[in-house]
């Protein structure tokens, strides 16, 4: 194939791949008709003048995972057809000015996972056709004004995993075609008003894992096409009332891991396309009426691991499409009987690790499609008559780790549980707490005659005496849970990352066998 170096493999499709620790310089001679060249996992430490001079037809050049620390300014001379250049995962600290001169066709430039300390406007001034610029995983502390001014066609810019402490409001002003901007895992403490005003076509903005404390009220007002906004793991303590007002296309918003103390009514919206809202790990103490009322299409709402002690009866107004509601690990003591009434499509509700001491009898009255209810680790002593009667699809009910009072009042619940044991799972059953003489005994098999009779004896016709048969051949056991949300974690999935670490967010939903507080 027009002379393939011994250290490389060359395919008929004009693709050359050179790998291995024994390679210490760009192999020669390279086939003149090569269109794709990959130099991976070698011990090359520098690129000298014009090592690719004779392969001017090259379209894609990947020089990744090497020891590369120095590049001569003329290293890429004569590569006028090059569209894709990756220098990712090397040891570059400095880019010579003019390095990309003459690369008039370049569309993708990957400089991620190096040790770059700074970039200058002159670095990219010749790259007017660039569509994608990856700079994540470097040591950049600031971006000078003008750095991207010539990249008017840029659609994707990744500056994540650097050491940026502030951003100039002018640095992105000419990037009107930008669709994806990633600034995650930096040290940003605030973002000046107007920073994103020029980004009228922006679809994704990733700001997670910074130290942002405050959002300017109009920060996103020009980003009408924004679909994904990642604000998780910052220090945001309050949301200005209008901050999300003009984001009609938004379908993903993550705010978990902040310091939010309250949510004002109407703060979210209108966002007709938002399907998931992740608010776990904040300091929210109450939910007022209509706080989510603009989120008509919301299907997943995660409010776990906050300090919620009060939910207004109309807090969930408007959430008619909601399927999953996670309220576990809060400070709830009481719930209004109407609080879930509007959630006609709710399938899974997670209320474990709260302080609930009783539930209203009508709490699930309008939520006929419930399939999973997590009530473990509360302070429930009994449940109202017929609370689960109408829940024909219920296949998972967790009631363990509550101080069940096994007097004669518990009989109706005990009888219903006896007939519906499969719903409880086999691993962890509810046990009596009082009276002391039956403490620790299974609520399902307890002989209530042994227990102390209650003050008033209820009329016995109570929980339905019809056995429950699952709709499907098998029902979930206690180790694997029916909740789909358990698998729908807010993983911010970036295809340009070398490795994507998907964290298991089961503890966020809290639907694991042993709860972790």
């Amino acid at each position: 194939y027009h002379g393939c170096p011994s250290e490389c493999t060359c395919s008929r499709a004009s693709q050359v791949e050179c790998t291995g620790a024994r390679i210490v310089a760009v192999p020669t001679p390279l086939p003149w008709n090569a269109m794709s060249l990959q130099i991976l996992n070698t011990h090359i430490t520098e690129l000298n003048e014009s090592p690719f001079l004779n392969i001017s037809a090259l379209i894609a050049l990947r020089i990744e995972k090497n020891e590369l620390s120095r590049i001569t300014p003329g290293a890429f001379r004569n590569l006028g057809s090059l569209r894709y250049l990756s220098l990712a995962n090397n040891k570059l600290q400095v880019l010579p000015i003019g390095l990309f001169q003459g690369l008039d066709s370049l569309e993708s430039l990957l400089l991620s996972s190096n040790q770059l300390l700074q970039i200058q406007p002159a670095h990219f001034s010749q790259c007017s056709n660039l569509k994608e610029l990856q700079l994540h995983g470097n040591h950049l502390e600031y971006i000078p004004d003008g750095a991207f001014d010539h990249l008017v066609g840029l659609t994707k810019l990744n500056l994540g995993k650097n050491s940026l402490t502030h951003i100039s409001p002018r640095v992105f002003q000419h990037l009107g075609n930008l669709q994806v901007l990633r600034l995650y895992e930096n040290r940003l403490t605030d973002i000046p008003m107007g920073t994103f005003d020029g980004l009228v076509n922006l679809q994704e903005l990733a700001l997670q894992q910074n130290q942002i404390g405050l959002l300017s009220p109009g920060l996103f007002h020009n980003n009408h096409n924004l679909q994904r906004l990642y604000l998780s793991n910052n220090h945001i303590s309050q949301l200005p009332p209008s901050v999300f007002m003009q984001l009609p296309q938004l379908n993903r918003l993550t705010l978990f891991g902040n310091s939010l103390k309250e949510l004002s009514p109407g703060i979210f919206g209108p966002m007709p396309n938002l399907r998931e809202l992740w608010l776990y790990d904040n300091h929210i103490s109450s939910l007022p009426d209509n706080v989510f009322s603009n989120l008509r299409q919301l299907q997943v709402l995660i409010l776990s691991r906050n300090q919620i002690s009060f939910i207004s009866p109309g807090a969930f107004n408007g959430l008619t499409e909601l399927r999953e509601l996670s309220l576990h690990t809060n400070a709830l003591q009481d719930l209004d009987g109407n609080v879930f009434r509007m959630l006609a499509n709710l399938q899974n509700i997670s209320l474990q690790n709260n302080r609930l001491r009783q539930l209203p009898g009508n709490i699930f009255a309008n939520v006929n499609g419930l399939m999973a209810i997590q009530l473990q680790n509360n302070q429930l002593e009994n449940l109202p008559l017929g609370i689960f009667d109408h829940l024909g699809k219920l296949c998972e009910l967790r009631l363990y780790d509550n101080p069940w009072r096994c007097d004669s009042d518990i009989l109706p619940l005990r009888n219903w549980l006896l007939l519906n044991q499969p719903r409880l799972g086999t691993d962890t059953v509810p046990v009596c707490f009082s009276p002391a003489n039956v403490r620790g005994q299974s609520l399902i098999i307890i002989n209530v005659n042994v227990a102390v009779p209650s003050v008033h004896v209820p009329e016995v016709p109570s929980y339905p005496e019809t056995p429950w048969y699952p709709d499907t051949p098998s029902y979930p056991d206690t180790t694997s849970v029916s909740s789909t949300t358990e698998l729908t974690s807010p993983v911010e999935d970036y295809t340009d990352l070398t490795t994507i670490q998907v964290t298991d967010d089961r503890s966020v939903w809290g639907m694991t066998q042993a709860q972790s507080g």
């Epitope: 046990v431 002391a436 005994q441």
Partner: antibody
């Protein structure tokens, strides 16, 4: 006879971790919850957390990021794992349970405690 | 978190006299539906582990002498030892379990 016996205390370096055990007898961990409480010398009681019969846990919010409570029912043992120790964690560590009391968070049976000293 | 504040820090009472210890919580411990105050008192004698005396503000634990009584509701609670005995010398702690438990700082009771 109901008994709770703590062990695993001793001298720990700052920044290190500890794993305390609470061996129980006279009752089953599948039926009763076990709390951990600590007390610095000459100071008051501080509730650390609890593991309930079914395995659910609750933690003191100020210490939650450093604490893990677990148990092995078959071994009748409850464990307290604490990371990133500092001098302020020097204390007597107790485990306790609610054997007779009607108070769900009441602690009417206590171990004798195990002493943890954090020092270089 | 709910903060429990005890007063006084220490108290010296003659044998046979009444001892009164106060405890104030930063928020109400009364649950309106169960009508219970989630408040308890513990006694810790020198060199010993703590002992539960009273829960739900006024319910004496089994085996606790009737000279110990608890009272109060909402945010203000009192432990009274009607006739102090030598064996009552101890530190007394209040505790709330309305939210996750927190203890008061303790009151040391000595004989005058």
């Amino acid at each position: 006879e109901v008994q709770l016996v703590e062990s695993g205390g001793g001298l720990v370096q700052p920044g290190g971790s500890l794993r305390l055990s609470c061996a129980v007898s006279g009752f089953s961990l599948t039926s009763y919850g076990v709390h951990w409480v600590r007390q610095a010398t000459g100071k008051g009681l501080e509730w650390l957390g609890v593991i309930w019969a079914g395995g659910s846990t609750n933690y003191n919010s100020a210490l939650m990021s450093r604490l893990t409570i677990s148990k092995e029912n078959a071994k009748s043992s409850v464990y307290l794992q604490m990371n990133s120790l500092r001098a302020g964690d020097t204390a007597m560590y107790y485990c306790a349970t609610h054997m007779i009391t009607e108070d769900y968070y009441g602690m009417d049976y206590w171990g004798q405690g195990t002493t943890v000293t954090v020092s270089s | 978190d709910i903060v429990m504040t005890q007063s006084p820090d220490s108290l010296a009472v003659s044998l046979g006299e009444r001892a009164t210890i106060n405890c104030k919580s930063s928020q109400s411990l009364l649950n309106s539906r169960t009508r219970k105050n989630y408040h308890a008192w513990y006694q810790q004698k020198p060199g010993q582990s703590p002992k539960l005396l009273i829960y739900w503000a006024s319910t004496r634990e089994s085996g606790v002498p009737d000279r110990f009584s608890g009272s109060g509701s909402g945010t203000d609670f009192t432990l009274t030892i009607s006739s102090l005995q030598a064996e009552d010398v101890a530190v007394y702690y209040c505790k709330q379990s309305y939210n996750l438990p927190t203890f008061g700082g303790g009151t040391k009771v000595e004989i005058k």
